[in-house]
């Protein structure tokens, strides 16, 4: 599916970081940049905790939820993303241990993952997914610009 390659859930690790139109690393959703976000994927990432004041973080979560809805609406890979996020929430266990008989993605679609940590994981998963999508789009534009300049 488009832009989904290179991601794995949970602990999604986009192969490429997100960059803005100016070539600089994109800021965090609330305007603060996670330390190390601009470093190449091959370099050790000194990504610190993205702590921020409560109000700003809540706003960021609202933006993420809205972004999540838009991604599902707009991407042709919406259904695939939904299943990825479900797996991200479910810790990538295919049924796990003990009384985990059903696949976690099914339990998620049944609305069982309603606790705050599951919601938090989903938000982090979407955040990293969007960063990867934006990063790939930008890099594609840069590649195309390079081709045009070379042609001229």
């Amino acid at each position: 599916s488009p832009a989904a390659a290179g991601l794995r859930f949970p602990g999604i690790r986009p192969e490429e970081e997100a960059y803005g139109e100016d070539g600089n690393p994109l800021p965090d959703f609330d305007g603060s940049e996670p330390p190390g976000a601009g470093s190449p994927a091959s370099a050790p990432r000194a990504a610190a905790a993205w702590y921020r004041p409560a109000g700003r973080r809540d706003v960021a979560h609202g933006i993420l939820n809205e972004a999540y809805r838009k991604v599902l609406d707009q991407l042709s890979a919406g259904k695939h993303l939904q299943s990825l996020v479900a797996r991200g929430v479910g810790g990538s266990l295919g049924g796990g241990a003990g009384d985990d008989a059903e696949p976690l993605s099914k339990r998620h679609s049944d609305g069982i993952f309603t606790d705050s940590y599951s919601r938090y994981r989903k938000q982090m998963a979407v955040k990293k997914y969007l960063a990867a999508v934006l990063g790939k789009r930008y890099k594609q534009r840069v590649k195309n610009k390079g081709r045009r300049i070379a042609y001229l």
């Epitope: 702590y51 979560h61 705050s116 990293k128």
Partner: antibody
Framework: QEQLVESGGGLVQPEGSLTLTCTAS?????????MCWVRQAPGKGLEWIGC????????TYFASWAKGRFTISKTSSTTVTLQMTSLTAADTATYFC??????????????WGQGTLVTVSS | AAVLTQTPSPVSAAVGGTVTINCQAS??????LAWYQQKPGQPPKLLIY???TLASGVPSRFSGSGSGTQFTLTISGVQCDDAATYYC????????????FGGGTEVVVK
């Protein structure tokens, strides 16, 4: 500077109860702040007890062995408590308070207190 | 419940050498793994989270890799200050969210 300070440790009788307090300074709990308790018996490894979403929902998460005997509560925007009942000598340990690292998908504790020692003995 | 097994312990290393510590989970935990360093009388210090992301302020000689059930912490160019006990910590779902620590690996620097 962000810090966590545990208090309330000390000597307690077997079958007794004790409440430990974790006080945050330099910050107050906000959305997706998971405050957790981890213990370490003398000369042994780390053992997770449980966590609470101290920022919003109050949802709690416990190790299987801790369910029922341990309770984690948020008592203010800067304090969480760990209530322990039916204590035995096996509960003798240093009890650490820790905060989950925001931005990590997994539970990962980026800020720790210095710990408070609980000794269960008659 | 997931069990995390660390090997080997203790590990001996020469200054400037490389140390590799393994952590095996009894069930797949994706990338849900963190690594800590602990010195006597101190609380643990987070080194790596989400299996391979370096925590803030941690020297780049520390690196983490792996996913699923097999994980590795590598210390390249070992320094005297790296003498400590190292713990892995995995998060998993089993009718609820849990996290568990490995038994620890002591690193001795010669």
């Amino acid at each position: 500077q962000e810090q966590l300070v545990e208090s309330g440790g000390g000597l307690v009788q077997p079958e007794g109860s004790l409440t430990l307090t974790c006080t945050a300074s330099g910050f107050s709990f906000s959305s997706s702040d998971y405050m957790c308790w981890v213990r370490q018996a003398p000369g042994k490894g780390l053992e997770w007890i449980g966590c609470i979403d101290a920022g919003s929902s109050g949802d709690t998460y416990f190790a299987s062995w801790a369910k029922g005997r341990f309770t984690i509560s948020k008592t203010s925007s800067t304090t969480v408590t760990l209530q322990m009942t039916s204590l035995t000598a096996a509960d003798t340990a240093t009890y650490f308070c820790a905060r989950h690292l925001y931005g990590s998908i997994t539970f990962a504790f980026g800020l720790w207190g210095q710990g408070t020692l609980v000794t269960v003995s008659s | 419940a997931a069990v995390l097994t660390q090997t080997p312990s203790p590990v001996s290393a020469a200054v400037g050498g490389t140390v590799t510590i393994n952590c095996q989970a009894s069930q797949s935990i994706g990338s849900d793994l963190a690594w800590y360093q602990q010195k006597p009388g101190q609380p643990p210090k987070l080194l790596i989270y989400d299996a391979s992301t370096l925590a803030s302020g941690v020297p780049s000689r520390f690196s983490g890799s792996g996913s699923g059930t097999q994980f590795t912490l590598t210390i390249s160019g070992v320094q005297c200050d790296d003498a400590a006990t190292y713990y892995c910590q995995g998060t998993y779902y089993s009718s609820g969210w849990y996290t568990a620590f490995g038994g620890g690996t002591e690193v001795v620097v010669k």
